[in-house]
Interface confidence: low
């Protein structure tokens, strides 16, 4: 808040000039302006200047009792109206009123535009108090004075519950043009004509304005701010700032880059981040993108085998982020791989080439001619079946996955074996009588495990009985047989 | 199994040398870059730099400009750091970390860390 | 240098919560950014990298997000054997700079 320092003076005298501590400063004395408070008018005379009369904002006081005489209207002083000065200097002005004694409680306080003034500014209040009236000076300063503090200054005071408002004191700070809007850096098509705006302003006005460019100046002739240059096209990067001039002197704006457009560099460091059997997981750093943003990226795939083609796989993804994971590749193959950007003038070129494999891919086809037959006197159930016929992206075979499912009333319990790769036959123990036993043998690779065979189910009766007839899936067919013994 | 296996604590005086090994194996140690970092006690880690495993090349922050050299030993697929003169300060753990790809420049295997106290 | 800003210092959760650790970067990263776990007496294990890839092995329930300045791991689900120090890693620019750390204490 303001602090109000209320200096008590020694008993001053009435006076009939100005009061104490009057402005002092390089300023211009105007015509008082229209009165701007909600007060009525009144006809009063002002107690230091007898016979003046002076139409200002003044509040009535109330008769006091029924016999006691109307006291004097109360107003502020006639004062300066306009003080014009430097950005930089430093301002003193004030406003004073005389107020009877029998007011004994009053506040003043420094409004400008309408909000009162509560931040770290120089506000003093002075009481030069008298037998009958107070003569009270409230001094606003401000210390080199910025644009910011240009408006209209008024004195509120309060009385009796009264509100006693000054006329406005304006404060116009001048100073070197003050830009309101500068050029901005852009990025321009080639030979295609664009806009450059520069705004400044005052006091003091007018401001006129100059481009420049590449350190050029281009209008012979000042425009009036604002000035919106028109540049019918560049092929080359430039430099555009522009001047600002008024009576006080001359401002030069930012410089900004213009840059025409371009393709983008080739992306750079490909990177393998993770390989399957059928995907790759790639990133990549984007190259400079040419002043323009990236739309889209390209991943172009070469299979890597003189038995291919050479046909170009793309595809295409977001410019970010800069990663891409490739799918539907085959396992167990060699890719090249080329990664390309665009903007909206072009295509890049394609980064380096980096070579990537495909993992092995799990077997595609099931074993064949599983065979099932129960081996009573051993409490064996024997599987037989023959090697299937795997591609070379599915990987060496490491071995085989039987799975034997037991149900009889109402259980149900599902074993996994594993074989090596060696054999085309194994046994199980039987795991429960009077059960259907259901056999599915899968092939397996590093990639992984290949399709379940159809089952073959065989049944393994109480002990006692005596059978050995197998069962059986021929190799080409779908049949669910069943051996019932 | 990618590993970094480091070698044990130290106890050295002020003035000494220290040189720990980080050795690696589950991969090619030359296709992978070897960053170091230090963590001084039950405090965060700062990354003292990291060496090219192809080249052999070293690259320093600035903090560790100076007393300390990374190297690294192809044939044993081992990178080490080597801190001389050394100081109260160099008390810490130091980790080494294996670059993860060469376009970026995270870490994606730490070794076990090999604490330093340096006491007189 | 680029600073790397992470919050909380600690933080404590129950088993099947969700919690996020965040981490702001001084300047723009993109989004290079790692996350790593790292339990008393273990090395660090990495749980993800360029903001949002998850490391081989590491469970779906550790999410990465964010780019530019902002970025944020997620564990859903929490789990006993989530207890321990996470912490973030910048790798755009040298020197590479590393988050505070978080301590993350099950209830």
């Known amino acids: 808040a303001i602090t109000e320092a209320r200096e008590e003076a020694k008993p001053y005298p009435l006076f009939p000039g100005p009061l104490p501590g009057s402005l002092q400063t390089d300023h211009t004395s105007l015509l008082s302006l229209p009165h701007t408070s909600g007060y009525q008018p009144a006809l009063m005379f002002s107690p230091t200047q007898p016979g003046r009369p002076y139409t200002g904002n003044v509040a009535i006081p109330r008769v006091t009792s029924a016999g006691s005489k109307l006291l004097p209207p109360l107003a502020f002083k006639h004062t300066v109206g306009h003080i014009i000065l430097s950005e930089h200097k430093d301002v003193k002005f004030n406003c004073s009123i005389s107020v009877p004694n029998i007011y004994q409680d009053t506040t003043i306080s420094w409004w400008k535009d309408g909000k009162e003034l509560l931040g770290a500014h120089h506000a003093i209040t002075q009481f030069y108090p008298d037998d009958e009236v107070t003569a009270i000076i409230a001094s606003f300063s401000i210390t080199s004075v910025q644009r910011s503090d240009n408006g209209s200054y008024i004195c509120k005071m309060k009385i009796n519950n009264e509100e006693i408002v000054s006329d406005p004191i304006y404060i116009e700070v001048q100073g070197l043009p003050h830009f309101t809007k500068q050029p901005e850096s852009m990025n321009v098509t080639r030979n295609t004509a664009f806009n450059l705006t520069c705004q400044a302003v005052g006091p003091p006005e007018p401001v006129n304005i100059f481009w420049v460019q590449n350190s050029s100046r281009v209008n012979e002739q000042p425009e009036k701010s604002p000035s919106v240059l028109t540049v019918p096209g560049l092929t080359e990067m430039a430099v555009f700032s522009c001047e600002a001039h008024n009576d006080k002197g001359l401002t030069v704006s930012k410089g900004v880059q213009i840059n025409i457009k371009a393709i983008p560099s080739p992306p750079t460091e490909v990177s393998i981040h993770n390989s399957t059997a059928h995907s790759i997981l790639i990133s990549w750093v984007p190259g400079f993108d040419g002043y323009s943003p990236f739309r889209n990226c390209s991943v172009q795939v070469k299979e890597v085998d003189p038995l291919s083609n050479g046909s170009v796989m793309i595809f295409n993804t977001s410019a970010s982020p800069h990663m891409y994971q490739i799918k539907q590749l085959q396992a167990l193959a060699n890719y090249s791989i080329g990664v390309s950007c665009m903007n909206e003038i072009g295509w890049s070129a394609v980064s380096p080439w980096i070579l990537a494999s495909t993992t092995e891919g799990a077997p595609s086809v099931a074993p064949l001619n599983v065979t099932v037959f129960l081996n009573e006197s051993r409490d064996n159930v024997d599987i037989r079946w023959m090697k299937p016929l795997t591609k070379r992206q599915a990987g060496e075979l490491v071995g085989y996955r039987i799975s034997h499912v037991w149900q009889s009333a109402g259980i149900s319990k599902e074993l996994l074996e594993e074989v090596g790769q060696n054999n085309s036959r194994a046994q199980i123990s039987v795991q429960v009588h009077n059960a259907t036993c259901t056999v599915r043998i899968a092939a397996v690779t590093k990639g992984g495990v290949g399709p379940f065979s159809d089952p073959v189910k065989i049944f393994i009766p109480a002990h006692g009985w005596v059978d050995h007839a197998p069962s059986s899936t021929p190799a080409p067919g779908n049949a669910d047989p069943v051996l019932i013994i | 199994l990618i590993q970094l296996v480091q070698s044990g604590p130290e106890l050295k005086k002020p003035g000494e040398t220290v040189k720990i090994s980080c050795k690696a194996s589950?991969?090619?140690?030359?296709?992978?870059?070897m960053n170091w970092v230090k963590q001084d006690p039950g405090k965060g880690l700062k990354w003292m730099g990291w060496?090219?495993?192809?080249?052999?090349?070293?690259t320093y922050a600035d903090d560790f400009k100076g007393r300390f050299v990374f190297s690294m030993e192809t044939s044993a697929s081992a990178a080490f750091l080597q801190i001389n003169n050394l100081k109260n300060e160099d008390t810490a753990t130091y980790f080494c970390?294996?670059?993860?790809?060469?376009?970026?420049?995270?870490?994606?295997?730490w070794g076990q860390g090999t604490t330093l106290t340096v006491s007189s | 240098d680029i600073v790397m800003t992470q919050s909380p210092k600690f933080m404590s959760t129950s088993v099947g919560d969700r919690v996020s650790i965040t981490c702001k970067a001084s300047?723009?990263?993109?989004?290079?950014v790692a996350w790593y776990k790292k339990k008393p007496g273990q090395s660090p294990k990495a749980l993800i990298n360029?903001?949002?890839n998850r490391h081989t092995g590491v469970p779906d329930r550790f999410t990465g997000s964010g780019s530019g300045t902002d970025f944020t791991l997620t564990i859903s689900n929490v789990q006993s054997e989530d207890l321990a120090d996470y912490f973030c890693?910048?790798?755009?620019?040298?020197?590479?700079?590393f988050g505070g750390g978080t301590k993350l204490e099950i209830k």
């Open positions: 890693l910048q790798h755009w620019n040298y020197p590479l700079t």
């Open positions: 060496i090219n495993t192809y080249t052999g090349e070293p």
């Open positions: 300047q723009n990263v993109r989004t290079a």
């Open positions: 589950g991969y090619t140690f030359t296709n992978h870059g």
């Open positions: 970390a294996r670059k993860g790809v060469t376009a970026a420049r995270y870490f994606d295997y």
């Open positions: 360029l903001a949002s």
